[in-house]
Structures are given as structure tokens and as C-alpha cells.
């Protein structure tokens, strides 16, 4: 037995790092390995984790650790039984994929404005918490072509759009996902989508006489 | 519930010996990192001795390397502290303490035993 | 090894005041700093870890915060069983962790 692809980490910078990795044929991870992690200097015993399959050869752990602090380094053992496969380091802070932002919510009660708003998924004493930015993604379930990603650089977890910019009459959904610049992270996976349908009606008479203000909002 | 009971203080002459005990309970002591914390009697505390969960590494400051030495009996949940060469400036009172699970803090200690060295 | 320097060594308050005790180290810790708590004849009680993490069972009022070099323990709405001294740990790299010179917090 032997490990095809060493394993490599993602930290979500809270409280869970997963691992991945590729064994040289079909494994029964749960069985026949384990991972043993333990931050460099502690005293008390290293955790140990137990894999899933994900696919033939492929393993995937989940490792539970305490709050991240930028200068933690794991020390990391892939053992079969006895056999020491693979031994490594990881460093959380230098390796961290977001949480996925959550409650992700349209509220199309204000006629000409779409305003999206989700959830940070840090508590405020993460640090990440404040140095999260996002993007939006908009598409058309009619219209392929017809997708859009929003840039959101500012730190509020939300988005105004005129509804005008999107086709009337049709449904559409949105995601959205995080990333920080501060860590250089990789970007969160995307929030579970959601659905709405874009019924904004231009009155003629709004669009006749008010055109030029109504493009400056 | 956690419980770490300290034993073995006592008076004792300026280069004497003394042996303390630990005996931990209500935790799965073998995978515990341990310690020895002192505190003088105008109250500062020194950490002077500590053991990871095997009992394979210790560490010592410098005040009292050479002269203490912490072990442990995992199969009998108990830590100790083994003092030699003992100088006046060692009275203190001497707890036994887990280190957390995930940090090297300490968040069980026990009530402590009383050490004095004095002719 | 890394000196702290807790502030003030001791001082009174009421009860329902807010207090500050500042722990100050001599080198970069991160966040690798604890706080403990001890009463008249017991023994310590661990507070905080992290900076700013209370453990288990520690009240609201109490926080902690600060990384690098200078941090802070907060307790708001002061209790009468809050009364005692207050040490900083840190635990940074190696084991030659040392304690701060404590602050004895009275009731005035």
C-alpha cells in the first residue's frame, strides 16, 4: 500500500481542516488508515482522524482543530496499521479556504431595486470575519448566456441591483461565495443557490418622463 | 469530574529531597500533556517541570534543571516530581496540572501541596 | 525566555465596575496566551486561551483580547465572586512558558 498523491490541506480558518489524498489502488480509508495530526510543541497526545472514500483511490479527511492562530503548525502522520506512509507538516493560516457564506436571501419588495443579503459564515471574533469579500453570481435558468458575476469589495454581506438590468417576466438565481485577501485565500465554495422571478414592469409613464434619473439610481 | 490530588509535601532541609505525587482522575490520563507549577510565597507562579502524554519528552527551566525531575505512571494515572539538592528559594506551594487538549494552557490544576525547605 | 509584564500589580474596584489587566511580553506571542484566575487558598482556574477564547464555563463578562504583544483581560459588571488575582500564561513555541506577576483585584 502506498500513497500515489500526498495528502494536501485546506483550512476553513475556524475550527476544521480537510485533507486529500491518493492511494495507489481502490482503499477502504475508513479501515485501513488513519491520519494523525498534532500542533508542533503540544504537550497532550496528536487526534487522530478517520478518512472517507471519495472515489476508488481517494481519501478525504476531516480534521478538528481548536481556533486557528497564524503561527500553528501541524505535524501530519498517514499511518496503515503499523506502516508509517507519509509523514508532512501543514500550516493552517497559509493554506485556507473560506467558509461558504449562508442564508443567501432576495428580497424583491422594493419595485425597481433587487437586494440581495447573506450571511457572514464567521462569529465576529474570527478574524476573518471582517476581511471577507464576495462574489455574486446571477444566471437565467431560460437563458444560458444570460450569467453574471457581481463583485462585492465592500465588507457588508449584501448587494443592490436595479431589476432592470435583469430580463423581466423570467426566473432567475443567484450564489455567492467568499474569499479574504489577507490570507490570500482560495475561494469558499458557493452557497446553496436561490430562486426568484424577476416580474419588474418599467411603468411608460416612470420611463417616458424620468429616464435620465432613473439611471443615475 | 476532573480531579488531580497532590501529595508528598513537607518540610525538608537545604539539600534534601522530596517526592511529590499526582493523582489524576476522571480523564483518560495517557493523553494528557502534564505539568508541575510552583507558586512562591509572594505569590508568583513558575512553571518547573513538564511531560508530554507518554512521558517521552520533559522540560525544565533553568532554575531547576539538574535537580527535579517530573515523570509519569501512565498505567496508574499518576505524576510526579522527584526534587533534589532543595534550597530555601524552592518553598512554595506545588501544583499538578493537565495541559488543555488543543493548547499547551492549563486547565485543570489540583489544590496543591505545601513545600518548605529550611535548617 | 519571553518576560511578561503584567499591569497593574493590584487594584479595587466595586461591584458592577468594568476593569482592564494588561499583560505586555517581551517578544511576539501571536495569540498563544492564556489567563487564569485565583481565589484566597485555591488553586488557579483556567479563563481564557487564545487571547481572547473563554473556556468552558467562564461568564460573558469576562473577555479577552490582543495578539503580538500586548493584551488585555476584560470584566465587565464586576461580581463579588470575580474578586482574586489574575495571571497571564503564554505558551508560545517550546516549553519555557512563563507566567505574568499577577494583578490582585480588591474590593474598595
Known amino acids: 500500500m502506498k500513497v500515489l498523491q500526498e495528502p494536501t490541506c485546506v483550512s476553513d480558518y475556524m475550527s476544521i481542516s480537510t485533507c486529500e489524498w491518493k492511494m495507489n489502488g481502490p482503499t477502504n480509508c475508513s479501515t485501513e488508515l488513519r491520519l494523525l495530526y498534532q500542533l508542533v510543541f503540544l504537550l497532550s497526545e496528536a487526534h487522530t482522524c478517520i478518512p472517507e472514500n471519495n472515489g476508488g483511490a481517494g481519501c478525504v479527511c476531516h480534521l478538528l482543530m481548536d481556533d486557528v492562530v497564524s503561527a500553528d503548525n501541524y505535524t501530519l502522520d498517514l499511518w496503515a496499521g503499523q506502516q508509517l506512509l507519509w509523514k508532512g507538516s501543514f500550516k493552517p493560516s497559509e493554506h485556507v479556504k473560506p467558509r461558504a457564506p449562508g442564508n443567501l436571501t432576495v428580497h424583491t419588495n422594493v419595485s425597481d431595486t433587487l437586494l440581495l443579503t447573506w450571511s457572514n459564515p464567521y462569529p465576529p471574533d474570527n478574524y476573518l470575519y471582517n476581511h471577507l469579500t464576495y462574489a455574486v453570481n446571477i444566471w437565467s435558468e431560460n437563458d444560458p448566456a444570460d450569467f453574471r458575476i457581481y463583485n462585492v469589495t465592500y465588507l457588508e454581506p449584501s448587494l443592490r441591483i436595479a431589476a432592470s438590468t435583469l430580463k423581466s417576466g423570467i426566473s432567475y438565481r443567484a450564489r455567492v461565495r467568499a474569499w479574504a485577501q489577507c490570507y490570500n485565500t482560495t475561494w469558499s465554495e458557493w452557497s446553496p443557490s436561490t430562486k426568484w422571478h424577476n416580474s419588474y414592469r418599467e411603468p411608460f409613464e416612470q420611463h417616458h418622463h424620468h429616464h435620465h434619473h432613473h439611471h443615475h439610481h | 469530574e476532573v480531579q488531580l490530588v497532590e501529595s508528598g509535601g513537607g518540610l525538608v532541609q537545604p539539600g534534601g529531597s522530596l517526592k511529590l505525587s499526582c493523582a489524576a482522575s476522571?480523564?483518560?490520563?495517557?493523553?494528557?500533556?502534564m505539568s508541575w507549577v510552583r507558586q512562591t510565597p509572594d505569590k508568583r507562579l513558575e512553571l518547573v517541570a513538564t511531560?508530554?502524554?507518554?512521558?517521552?519528552?520533559?522540560s525544565y527551566p533553568d532554575s531547576v534543571k539538574g535537580r527535579f525531575t517530573i515523570s509519569r505512571d501512565n498505567a496508574k494515572n499518576t505524576l510526579y516530581l522527584q526534587m533534589s539538592s532543595l534550597k530555601s528559594e524552592d518553598t512554595a506551594m506545588f501544583y499538578c496540572?493537565?495541559?488543555?487538549?488543543?493548547?499547551?494552557?492549563?486547565?485543570?490544576w489540583g489544590q496543591g501541596t505545601s513545600v518548605t525547605v529550611s535548617s | 525566555d519571553i518576560q511578561m509584564t503584567q499591569s497593574p500589580a493590584s487594584l479595587s474596584a466595586s461591584v458592577g465596575e468594568t476593569v482592564t489587566i494588561t499583560c505586555r511580553t517581551s517578544?511576539?506571542?501571536?495569540?498563544?496566551l492564556a489567563w487564569y484566575q485565583q481565589k484566597q487558598g485555591k488553586s488557579p482556574q483556567f479563563l481564557v486561551y487564545?487571547?481572547?477564547t473563554l473556556a468552558e464555563g467562564v461568564p460573558s463578562r469576562f473577555s479577552g483580547s490582543g495578539s503580538g504583544t500586548q493584551f488585555s483581560l476584560n470584566i465587565n459588571s464586576l461580581q463579588s465572586e470575580d474578586f482574586g488575582s489574575y495571571y497571564c500564561?503564554?505558551?508560545?513555541?517550546?516549553?519555557?512558558?512563563?507566567f505574568g506577576g499577577g494583578t490582585k483585584l480588591e474590593i474598595k
Open positions: 496540572a493537565r495541559f488543555f487538549r488543543f493548547r499547551n494552557a492549563m486547565d485543570y
Open positions: 476522571g480523564f483518560t490520563f495517557s493523553t494528557y500533556g
Open positions: 511531560i508530554n502524554s507518554n512521558g517521552g519528552s520533559t
Open positions: 517578544e511576539n506571542i501571536y495569540s498563544y
Open positions: 487564545n487571547a481572547k
Open positions: 500564561q503564554h505558551y508560545y513555541g517550546p516549553p519555557t512558558w512563563t
